[in-house]
C-alpha cells in the first residue's frame, strides 16, 4: 500500500482537455496509474496514463475530443479517479467530483505579433486558443514586459479587465530589445486560475532620430 499525503488537481481548458496532476508522498515511481473520467450525463468515459513529472508527482491530459470541440458544459460533473495497479488489482488513490467550469485554466495565448513599433511605444496583438464560446467577452488578461537587465519576476503586471486582445506599450526606451508575454483567465469559476504565460515575443524599439530629443 502507498502511504503519505496525496493531492489531485485538475483543470479544464474550456473545450476538450482536462489536465491533471497527482502528487503522492512515498509513492513508487514505477507504479502504473491511470486517471479515469466518468461524466454524469455523457455516454463516454476517458482514461489517461499518469506519467512522472518529478519525484512524487505525475501528470496526464484527458483528451476528450478534437481541440476546438465543446465537450462539457457548465452543468456537467465529471467523477475523476486516480487508480494505481497493485499486483493484479487496481486501487483508487484519489477521487473528486469535478465541476469543469469551476476549475478552468485556458491554453496560453498564441500568435503574438508586433502590429506597430515606434521609438517609445509598441502595439502588440495576440489570440486566445481553444477558449469556449460560452465566455463571450468575460475574460481578462495579464501582460508583462521584460526590460534589459531585469527578470520576468521583476516585471510589473499590466492588467486588462476585459477581452482585449491587444496592448499598446508606452514609455519604452528607443533602440532597445524587449520581450513580452500575456496570459488569460475567465471570470467564471471558483477555482479558476491563470493560463500559462504565452511564448515570449521579442521586439526592438526604433532608434531615436538623430538630432532630436528623446
Amino acid at each position: 500500500a502507498v502511504n503519505g499525503t496525496s493531492q489531485f488537481t485538475c483543470f479544464y481548458n474550456s473545450r476538450a482537455n482536462i489536465s491533471c496532476v497527482w502528487s503522492q508522498d512515498g509513492a513508487l515511481q514505477d507504479t502504473s496509474c491511470q486517471v479515469h473520467a466518468w461524466p454524469d450525463r455523457r455516454r463516454w468515459n476517458q482514461t489517461c496514463e499518469l506519467l512522472p513529472v518529478s519525484q512524487a508527482s505525475w501528470a496526464c491530459n484527458l483528451i476528450l475530443g478534437a481541440p476546438d470541440s465543446q465537450k462539457l458544459t457548465t452543468v456537467d460533473i465529471v467523477t475523476l479517479r486516480v487508480l494505481c495497479r497493485e499486483g493484479v488489482r487496481w486501487r483508487v488513490m484519489a477521487i473528486q467530483d469535478f465541476k469543469p467550469f469551476e476549475n478552468l485554466r485556458l491554453m496560453a495565448p498564441i500568435s503574438l505579433q508586433v502590429v506597430h513599433v515606434e521609438t517609445h511605444r509598441c502595439n502588440i496583438s495576440w489570440e486566445i486558443s481553444q477558449a469556449s464560446h460560452y465566455f463571450e467577452r468575460h475574460l481578462e488578461f495579464e501582460a508583462r514586459t521584460l526590460s534589459p537587465g531585469h527578470t520576468w519576476e521583476e516585471a510589473p503586471l499590466l492588467t486588462l479587465k476585459q477581452k482585449q486582445e491587444w496592448i499598446c506599450l508606452e514609455t519604452l526606451t528607443p533602440d532597445t530589445q524587449y520581450e513580452f508575454q500575456v496570459r488569460v483567465k475567465p471570470l467564471q469559476g471558483e477555482f479558476t486560475t491563470w493560463s500559462p504565460w504565452s511564448q515570449p515575443l521579442a521586439f526592438r524599439t526604433k532608434p531615436a532620430a538623430l538630432g532630436k530629443d528623446t
Epitope: 491511470q34 479515469h36 482514461t47 496514463e49 483528451i63 487496481w90
Partner: nanobody
Framework: QVQLVESGGGLVQAGGSLRLSCTVS????????MAWFRQAPGKEREFVAL????????EYVDSVKGRFTVSRDNAKNTVYLQMNNLKPEDTAVYYC????????????????WGQGTQVTVSS
Amino acid sequence: QVQLVESGGGLVQAGGSLRLSCTVSGDVFVRYTMAWFRQAPGKEREFVALVTDSGRTTEYVDSVKGRFTVSRDNAKNTVYLQMNNLKPEDTAVYYCAANTDYFRIRSLDANTWGQGTQVTVSS
C-alpha cells in the same frame, strides 16, 4: 467516428515474423488505449496485447510474452504488433481495437473494431 484499418497479415512459416499495423482515422488518436485481439477458427476472440495512450505501458497475454511487441506512433496515428517466433497456434484473424477507457478494453469492450487481418502460421 473513429475508423481502424489493419494491414500486414499473411502466410508465414513457424519461427518467422510478421508486423501488423493498424491506422486510426476520424478522431484524436492519443485519446485511445489501443489493443490487439485475435480469433482462431472455432474459438472465441481473445486479448493479445495493449498499449496505453501515452505508450508507456504495454500488456500481453501470457502465451505471446517475449515474442510479440506492441507499440504506437502517435505522430502517424498507428499502432503496431511485431510478432516474432510465430507458432502454428498463433494462426487467427487479428483485430485492432480502440477504447477511450483503458479499463474497458481488456474485457473485449471496444469503442471500435477493425475489420481484421488474417495471420496463418504453417508448420
